[in-house]
């Protein structure tokens, strides 16, 4: 990062509680690791506004790691 | 309604101080994150320092470190920016922003969106030589 210098964690603060799905391109899961003692998930944004931090407790990021880790197991 | 206003910018000699201030209403303090942000003639928006309320944590970027405090009140629901060492390159338009879901490696190249930013107004800082 060259501006930031990397904390523990890539999110500051809790995180958004939904994104709108159709703005969604990609999600992002970082499981818990001695950079970050939390689960973070990520959402990169369509049309190019960047990404979002989607707080791990929402409704809508639970779907999404369950969504992932099924596919992944 | 949810306001940000940003006071404290003013003219400074190099190697001078200045404390920025933003006072925030109309949202729950601890469920964002508070920045300052600023943008200088002809350049892009940049991240100067954060602050999550949730956890106390603070970001600085390379160019502020050592020399940028940010603080804040929480019974005021207010955000410090304590500059020190002040330098002509720190000349700019500052920013307060109160933002939910920041990406820290993505505050050199910070998209605002409406549904998760909330801005002030600015408030000028220059620095002469």
């Known amino acids: 990062f060259p501006m930031f210098k990397r904390g523990r964690c890539l999110c500051i603060g809790p995180g958004v509680k939904a994104v709108k799905v159709a703005d969604i391109e990609k999600a992002s899961i970082m499981y818990p690791s001695n950079n970050c003692d939390k689960i973070e998930v990520i959402i990169t944004l369509k049309e190019n506004k960047g990404q979002r931090c989607l707080n791990p407790k929402s409704k809508q990021a639970r779907l999404i790691i369950k969504k992932v880790e099924r596919k992944n197991f | 309604e949810v306001q940000l206003v940003e006071s404290g910018g003013g003219l400074v000699q190099a190697g001078g101080s200045l404390r920025l201030s933003c006072a925030t209403s109309?949202?729950?303090?601890?469920?964002?994150?508070i920045g300052w942000f600023r943008q200088a003639p002809g350049k892009e928006r940049e991240g100067v320092s954060i602050l999550s309320s949730s956890d106390g944590s603070t970001y600085y970027a390379d160019s502020v470190k050592g020399r940028f405090t940010i603080s804040s009140d929480n019974a005021k629901n207010t955000v410090y920016l304590q500059m020190n060492s002040l330098k002509p390159e720190d000349t700019a338009v500052y920013y307060c922003a109160a933002g939910q879901g920041w990406v820290i490696a993505t505050m050199t190249s910070f998209r605002a969106h409406r549904e998760y930013d909330y801005w002030g107004q600015g408030t000028q800082v220059t620095v002469s030589s």
């Open positions: 109309g949202f729950t303090f601890d469920d964002y994150a």
